[in-house]
Amino acid sequence: EEELQVIQPDKSVLVAAGETATLRCTATSLIPVGPIQWFRGAGPGRELIYNQKEGHFPRVTTVSDLTKRNNMDFSIRIGNITPADAGTYYCVKFRKGSPDDVEFKSGAGTELSVRAKPSAPVVSGPAARATPQHTVSFTCESHGFSPRDITLKWFKNGNELSDFQTNVDPVGESVSYSIHSTAKVVLTREDVHSQVICEVAHVTLQGDPLRGTANLSETIRVPPTLEVTQQPVRAENQVNVTCQVRKFYPQRLQLTWLENGNVSRTETASTVTENKDGTYNWMSWLLVNVSAHRDDVKLTCQVEHDGQPAVSKSHDLKVSAHPKEQGSNTAAENTGSNERNIY
């Protein structure tokens, strides 16, 4: 009678992560008597995957009933496949022995390859905000994919970026891979509403790439421009001085009025108006009583924006010639106005 052969008909099997892998194996004879075992890998470090004789294998089911006397089909199914299951699987026939069974013949092996989807890309920006005209770096990471081939693109508001560097790790063979990319983006004053997008394409995604986004509103700081102006109000001895704070982002802003270098009032931006580009405008005013003043007054609007060093704009108030009333000024009637007498 011809000697038993162990046939593994599939040289390779490709399975998507989460699915079930079927590893086929048949024997050509019932003799010699003894169990079949499945291993991943060869040599002394091989891992036991299934033993017909003993052991508990919660992920493995046999395709046919191995308890049947004339069974020669030793195929197995492995459920919930992950990239860690990749490798070459050997179906090995043992001959019954005492005290231990003896390895008799091995199949040629079946290479199990696992296709695993990349994780959703995570985009992260710089730890600190930066101002327009500065270049900032964004990173994009995605993990757990297999095979290694992957494509990554960067976009800013739909426009593809070219200044980036990408690495796929590890360099050698692995059960799964990770991608890490760093892109450089030049900020503009209009970027409050902008988005940076990292797009990952992989064979497992069937042409529907994964995207990770970062809002530049988390990254950009647009410093304000200041303008201090003086207008007369109804009473002849009062002057309304306004400080226009324009085009700033984020909203966190504190304004201090100084009169001849002395702090007059400090307030925090609350009721701001938003511009189309996402930046904010705000206005603060001071009602100055200029009667009984011999000297000119230097008024300074000092703004601390988003924890940055203060910027300021000054205005010299001439007290020698009191301004005439020039009609109503709605800003002066605002309940938020503050009257300040200068002595």
């Epitope: 003993e54 052991g55 508990h56 919660p58 992920r59 919930n80 005290p99």
Partner: antibody, heavy 123, light 108 residues
């Protein structure tokens, strides 16, 4: 830390169905290679494995009790239940909820045990 | 079904002595599939040794295990007062999983 807590009626009438629940914390039954099971111990006697269920929903039962036993895990994966039908006085025992871990190469053992709940079958 | 038989049923020893507990299997089993548990009165069992000879987490090294095929042994080199309990062997070689009937280790 891992905690297992059995709950259920202390007294069941003969021929009725015994229902026990094990609430666990400190791990997830969504995790690969983790299972939950039940072991019982009649008063003054030894331990008897009843059943266990793995993270992937595969169930294993004692051949002696298979026709009367059902093990299940709920969707939230923080509870495992045991139902034993047509009970008799011989089913009186302390019922332990156990965690079973699979360590590869066919090896699995009972790593954590609940404190047990005594179920008496009596009319 | 694999039947495990433990001997002796009761073992009476004094603290400081050496204890040897036996577990015999009705079928040959690989050493990786034989485990030992300890149960103190009023408590749940706890894993003591797995795979014949590996100590579970937190188990002192006065406990050791050995054996192969059908005969397995649990040894306690120097008995401490807290070691007096019931000891069970368990096989994970085949479903149904089975336990021995237990050996009660009592103070002489």
């Amino acid at each position: 830390q891992v905690q297992l807590q059995e709950s259920g009626p202390g007294l069941v009438k003969p021929s009725e169905t015994l229902s026990l629940t094990c609430t666990f914390s400190g791990f997830s039954l969504n995790t690969y290679d983790i299972g939950m099971g039940w072991i019982r111990q009649p008063p003054g006697k030894g331990l008897e494995w009843i059943a266990h269920i793995w993270w992937n929903d595969r169930e294993y039962y004692s051949s002696a009790l298979q026709s009367r036993v059902t093990i299940s895990k709920d969707t939230s994966k923080t509870q495992v239940s045991l139902k034993l039908s047509s009970v008799t006085a011989a089913d009186t025992a302390v019922y332990y909820c156990v965690r079973i871990d699979y360590f590869g190469s066919g090896q699995a053992w009972f790593t954590y045990w609940g404190q047990g709940t005594l179920v008496t079958v009596s009319s | 079904e694999i039947v495990l038989t433990q001997s002796p049923g009761t073992l009476s020893l004094s603290p400081g002595e050496r204890a040897t507990l036996s577990c015999s299997s009705s079928s040959t089993i690989s050493s990786t599939y034989l485990h030992w548990y300890q149960q103190k009165p009023g408590q749940a069992p706890r894993l003591l040794i797995y795979g014949t000879s590996n100590l579970a987490s937190g188990i002192p090294d006065r406990f050791s295990g050995s054996g192969s095929g059908t005969d397995f042994t649990l040894t306690i080199s120097r008995l401490e007062p807290e070691d007096f309990a019931v000891y069970y062997c368990q096989q994970g070689s085949r479903i149904p999983f089975t336990f021995g009937q237990g050996t009660k280790l009592e103070i002489k």
